[in-house]
C-alpha cells in the first residue's frame, strides 16, 4: 500500500502549471514500504522502522523517508599523506651481517643515525614527517626507505604533496651528492654514493570529495555536487541555499525529484505563482483586504 | 649499557709522549668502531683517530705519524699512543665508540662517550 497521510494543508502548483495538494511527499520518487512486525511502518526508501520512527538511509530524511536531503555530510580526512620509497647507498658505514636483524643493537644504532641524518635533510619541508627503514643490504650498506610526508587536507592536497616530493628528490639528491667520502674518510655524519639514489615508487592519499558525493547521493547523483565553504567541501542539491549552484524559488518551495530540482509554487490569498522559479505572479482579481 | 672510562691524561713537556686508555664495559669489543676526539679550549670537538674492529685504523692529519690508536679485544679497551706532543695538542681527550663500522670521525656518528682527560703540553 502506497496511502499516504497530508500533514500540511498549503497549497502547492508545480512549475507546470497544475495544482496539486501536498503533503511534504515527493510523488515521482520510487517507494517501496517497510514492515516490521505488526507495524506498517511506511519507511519508505530503504528506510526501517526502529520501534519509533523510521531511520532513513541517505540521502533521505522525513517521517516516512519520503524526502530527499539538501545537503549530504561528506568528511574529506583531516589530514592526507604521501609515501616515498626510496633508496641510498650510505658508504660511511660497512656492512655487518647484525644490521639484517631489525632488532639487533647495531640495527636500532643505524636507525638512529639514519633518522637524526634524513631529519636534517629533509628539515626545510613542512609535509616531512620521517623516514622508515624497511630494509638493508650489503653494499656498503643499502637503504631502502619509506620517507612519509603529511598536510592538512585542502581542495589543492596533490599539488602540495606533489611539490613536497619533489623537494624531497631535490633535498636527497643535493647531499648524497656533497656528502661523500674523501681519501676513504667521512666528515660527515653520513656519506654516501652519489649513484646510489634512487625513487622506486610515490603513493599519495586518493580522496575525492566529489566521487564520495555522487556515491552518497545514489540515484541522485547526477544533481548534488561539490562546492567549497572556507577549504572545506559540500555536498548539497540545488535546494540547499546559501551556494553558487544553489535555486532560487522565489515564492515557492525547492524539491528534489528524480528529474532533479524543481520549484513548487505558493498560491497565497492574493496571488497565485507560477514559472520555473515562481517568480511569475498573477494577482487575483476582486479580492478585497480589509485592515 | 655501554660505559666508557678515560684515563692517562696529564701535563708533558713539548716533545714528550703520553699513553691514553679507555676501559669499555658493556661493548661487544670485536665489533663497531671506537675513536678518539678532543675538544680544546674555544674550539669545537674534533676527530683525533679511529680504529674498527677488524683493525683498520684513520687519522687526522694534524695527528698523522704521531699518533697511533690500537683496542685490546680482549681487555675491551682503547688505546691512543701520543708522541712528540706540542703545544697545540692541548685539549680534553674523550674515547668514543659506536656498534657499527664507522668510516667517519663525526662526532654526531658516535652514540657512546667516555668522561674527558685532560692533557696539557707545557713547558
Known amino acids: 500500500p502506497l496511502a499516504t497521510i497530508p500533514v500540511s494543508t498549503t497549497s502547492l502548483t508545480s512549475s507546470e502549471g497544475s495544482t496539486i495538494s501536498t503533503p511534504s511527499v515527493d510523488i515521482s520518487t520510487p517507494v517501496t514500504t517497510s514492515i516490521v512486525g505488526d507495524q506498517c511502518s511506511r519507511c519508505k526508501n530503504g528506510g526501517f522502522w526502529d520501534g519509533l520512527k523510521c531511520q532513513c538511509l541517505t540521502p533521505y530524511y522525513g517521517e516516512s523517508c519520503e524526502e530527499v536531503v539538501n545537503s549530504i555530510d561528506i568528511a574529506p580526512p583531516e589530514t592526507v599523506s604521501a609515501q616515498m620509497e626510496l633508496t641510498v647507498t650510505v658508504t660511511s658505514v660497512k656492512f655487518t651481517d647484525e644490521l639484517k636483524n631489525h632488532s639487533s643493537q647495531e640495527f636500532r644504532e643505524f636507525n638512529k643515525t639514519f633518522t637524526e641524518q634524513m631529519n636534517i635533510v629533509y628539515s626545510g619541508i613542512p609535509e616531512y614527517v620521517g623516514v622508515n627503514i624497511t630494509n638493508l643490504r650489503l653494499g656498503s650498506v643499502v637503504v631502502e626507505h619509506d620517507v612519509l610526508l603529511r598536510t592538512k587536507y585542502t581542495p589543492e592536497y596533490k599539488t602540495a604533496l606533489d611539490n613536497a616530493t619533489e623537494v624531497v628528490k631535490q633535498k636527497i639528491t643535493k647531499v648524497t651528492t656533497e656528502q661523500i667520502m674523501t681519501n676513504d674518510n667521512c666528515s660527515a655524519l653520513m656519506c654516501f654514493n652519489t649513484t646510489g639514489t634512487q625513487v622506486q615508487n610515490i603513493t599519495v592519499t586518493q580522496y575525492d570529495p566529489v566521487e564520495e558525493c555522487r556515491q552518497k547521493a545514489e540515484e541522485y547523483e547526477d544533481y548534488f555536487l561539490v562546492e567549497y565553504r572556507d577549504q572545506k567541501p559540500y555536498c548539497i542539491s540545488p535546494c540547499e541555499s546559501g551556494f553558487n549552484a544553489s535555486k532560487n524559488c522565489n515564492h515557492g518551495k525547492c524539491q528534489m525529484s528524480q528529474n532533479g530540482a524543481r520549484c513548487l509554487c505558493v498560491t497565497t490569498e492574493t496571488h497565485w505563482y507560477s514559472g520555473e522559479d515562481c517568480n511569475q505572479g498573477t494577482q487575483k482579481s476582486h479580492h478585497h483586504h480589509h485592515h | 649499557d655501554v660505559q666508557l672510562q678515560a684515563s692517562g691524561g696529564g701535563l708533558v713537556q713539548p716533545g714528550g709522549s703520553l699513553r691514553l686508555s679507555c676501559a669499555a664495559s658493556?661493548?661487544?669489543?670485536?665489533?663497531?668502531?671506537m675513536a678518539w676526539f678532543r675538544q680544546a679550549p674555544g674550539k669545537e670537538r674534533e676527530g683525533v683517530a679511529f680504529?674498527?674492529?677488524?683493525?683498520?685504523?684513520s687519522y687526522a692529519e694534524s695527528v698523522k705519524g704521531r699518533f697511533t690508536i690500537s683496542r685490546d679485544n680482549a681487555l675491551s679497551s682503547l688505546y691512543l699512543q701520543m708522541n712528540s706532543l706540542r703545544a697545540e695538542d692541548t685539549a680534553v681527550y674523550y674515547c668514543?665508540?659506536?656498534?657499527?663500522?664507522?668510516?667517519?670521525?663525526?662526532?654526531?656518528?658516535?652514540?657512546?662517550w667516555g668522561q674527558g682527560t685532560m692533557v696539557t703540553v707545557s713547558s
Open positions: 680504529i674498527n674492529s677488524d683493525g683498520r685504523t
Open positions: 668514543a665508540a659506536s656498534l657499527l663500522y664507522l668510516m667517519t670521525v663525526n662526532a654526531a656518528a658516535y652514540p657512546y
Open positions: 658493556g661493548f661487544p669489543s670485536s665489533r663497531g668502531t
